[in-house]
Interface confidence: low
């Protein structure tokens, strides 16, 4: 699987999950998040050669098409597969609130 | 929606579904498919600016991050959202077989 266990331990040029730390205030302008100050959102990048973690029949077809027609602009793209939530603390007035934001952390990628 | 109805009628630079005809024999080397000779597989392409058909909270975050940090390499990617099957005719020996291949035709795209 193109997950953090594999991708963070290997120098992988093709589609893989990459570490990306986001500071809520500095990178997003989100003043409202009290804790954490930031988090590892991660992201997916890298080429999607034929059959690499193909998501659907279409991505398999497109990967093959791209291999046989290298000048073509149509090719699968490396995108998130498994995502995890992030728990944040913020305030409504002086009242602390804890909320789980869904799909915030990329754990693995696929070619779609 | 970034679907064929919208995308095929507009000159849209951002993420949208694009027409792509694939000839089974010439483009894929699939000699085994008898009918159809080819089909519109279509594909997704175009930049994913902040909030454009964002698939998850992560793609929203990444889009905003990319907007505020334009030098960053991390950005959402335009990929298939809705796919439709394709019915094909092929032969096993002299026996014709009809089969529906799932997820063969891209009908709409999203930023993931």
């Amino acid at each position: 699987a193109l997950d953090t266990n594999y991708c963070f331990r290997n120098l992988e040029e093709n589609c893989c999950v990459r570490p990306l730390y986001i500071d809520f205030r500095q990178d997003l302008g989100w003043k409202w998040v009290h804790e954490p100050k930031g988090y590892y959102a991660n992201f997916c990048s890298g080429p999607c050669p034929y059959l690499r973690s193909a998501d659907t029949t279409h991505s398999t077809v497109l990967g093959l098409y791209n291999t046989l027609n290298p000048e073509a602009s149509a090719s699968p793209c490396c995108v998130p597969q498994d995502l995890e939530p992030l728990t944040i603390l913020y305030y409504v007035g002086r009242t602390p609130k804890v909320e789980q934001l869904s799909n915030m952390v990329v754990k693995s990628c696929k070619c779609s | 929606a970034l679907d064929t109805n919208y995308c095929f009628r507009n000159l849209e630079e951002n993420c949208c579904v694009r027409p792509l005809y694939i000839d089974f024999r010439q483009d894929l080397g699939w000699k085994w498919v008898h009918e159809p000779k080819g089909y519109y597989a279509n594909f997704c392409s175009g930049p994913c600016p902040y909030l454009r058909s964002a698939d998850t909270t992560h793609s929203t975050v990444l889009g905003l991050y990319n907007t505020l940090n334009p030098e960053a390499s991390a950005s959402p990617c335009c990929v298939p959202q809705d796919l439709e099957p394709l019915t094909i005719l092929y032969y096993v020996g002299r026996t014709p077989k009809v089969e529906q291949l799932s997820n063969m035709v891209v009908k709409s795209c999203k930023c993931s």
């Epitope: 989100w30 934001l101 | 909030l51």
Partner: antibody, heavy 120, light 106 residues
Framework: QVTLRESGPALVKPTQTLTLTCTFS??????????VGWIRQPPGKALEWLAH???????SYSTSLKTRLTISKDTSKNQVVLTMTNMDPVDTATYYC????????????WGQGTLVTVSS | DIQMTQSPSSLSASVGDRVTITCRAS??????LNWYQQKPGKAPKLLIF???SLQSGVPSRFSGSGSGTDFTLTISSLQPEDFATYYC????????FGQGTKVEIK
């Protein structure tokens, strides 16, 4: 596609209470970080922010109008309601509702506005 | 409350001109500054957010700069459709709009 539409009376009498409804589609106020705000614009004058409500029912009001304003939401109906008490002719304006995404602090989608005239 | 002061309040320009509008905050607002364009009878349209980030779909001739208390909106080459009123908005503490700058045809 995000759309917002304001509705309410075109004419109110002085001292009456104005109730405006913003009906929206293309997003949900149950989504973390989502907000809807109200802004008004008297004829030929500048924009003035009135109030805001967020997905978590956090509300904020313009300091100068805080005692007259109440904002609420009905998530299931995709509606936000603004009430303004003790209307005066100086409150004659076009009232807009607009979406604020993820507390980013700006309004990226607006309704077309509804003109409210205060007159006896 | 934070006050936003725009200058000039109006200006006359020709197609192709470079136009600059400034906005000054009464206290430090970091980069929590947005710009909107409004045409008569229409709702405002977001142009720039976070002081310098171009909203999706907005032509690249629009640009924003500044931080702290002083901000600028620049139209590098004025087009016929750019004649409108422009507003700045601070969101550092609550929301405040500037009084607007009307860009008219010379």
């Amino acid at each position: 596609q995000v759309t917002l539409r304001e509705s309410g009376p075109a004419l109110v009498k002085p001292t009456q209470t104005l109730t405006l409804t913003c009906t929206f589609s293309g997003f949900s106020l149950s989504t973390s970080g989502m907000g809807v705000g109200w802004i008004r614009q008297p004829p030929g004058k500048a924009l003035e922010w009135l109030a805001h409500i967020y997905w978590n029912d956090d509300k904020s009001y313009s300091t100068s109008l805080k005692t007259r304003l109440t904002i609420s939401k009905d998530t299931s109906k995709n509606q936000v309601v603004l009430t303004m008490t003790n209307m005066d002719p100086v409150d004659t304006a076009t009232y807009y509702c607009a979406r604020d995404f993820y507390y980013s602090g700006y309004f990226d989608s607006w309704g077309q506005g509804t003109l409210v005239t205060v007159s006896s | 409350d934070i006050q936003m002061t725009q200058s000039p309040s109006s200006l006359s320009a020709s197609v192709g001109d470079r136009v600059t509008i400034t906005c000054r905050a009464s206290q430090d607002i970091s980069n929590y500054l947005n710009w909107y364009q409004q045409k008569p009878g229409k709702a405002p349209k977001l142009l720039i957010f976070g002081a310098s980030s171009l909203q999706s779909g907005v032509p690249s001739r629009f640009s924003g700069s500044g931080s702290g208390t002083d901000f600028t909106l620049t139209i590098s080459s004025l087009q016929p459709e750019d004649f409108a009123t422009y507003y700045c908005q601070q969101t550092n503490t609550m929301n405040t709009f500037g009084q607007g700058t009307k860009v008219e045809i010379k």
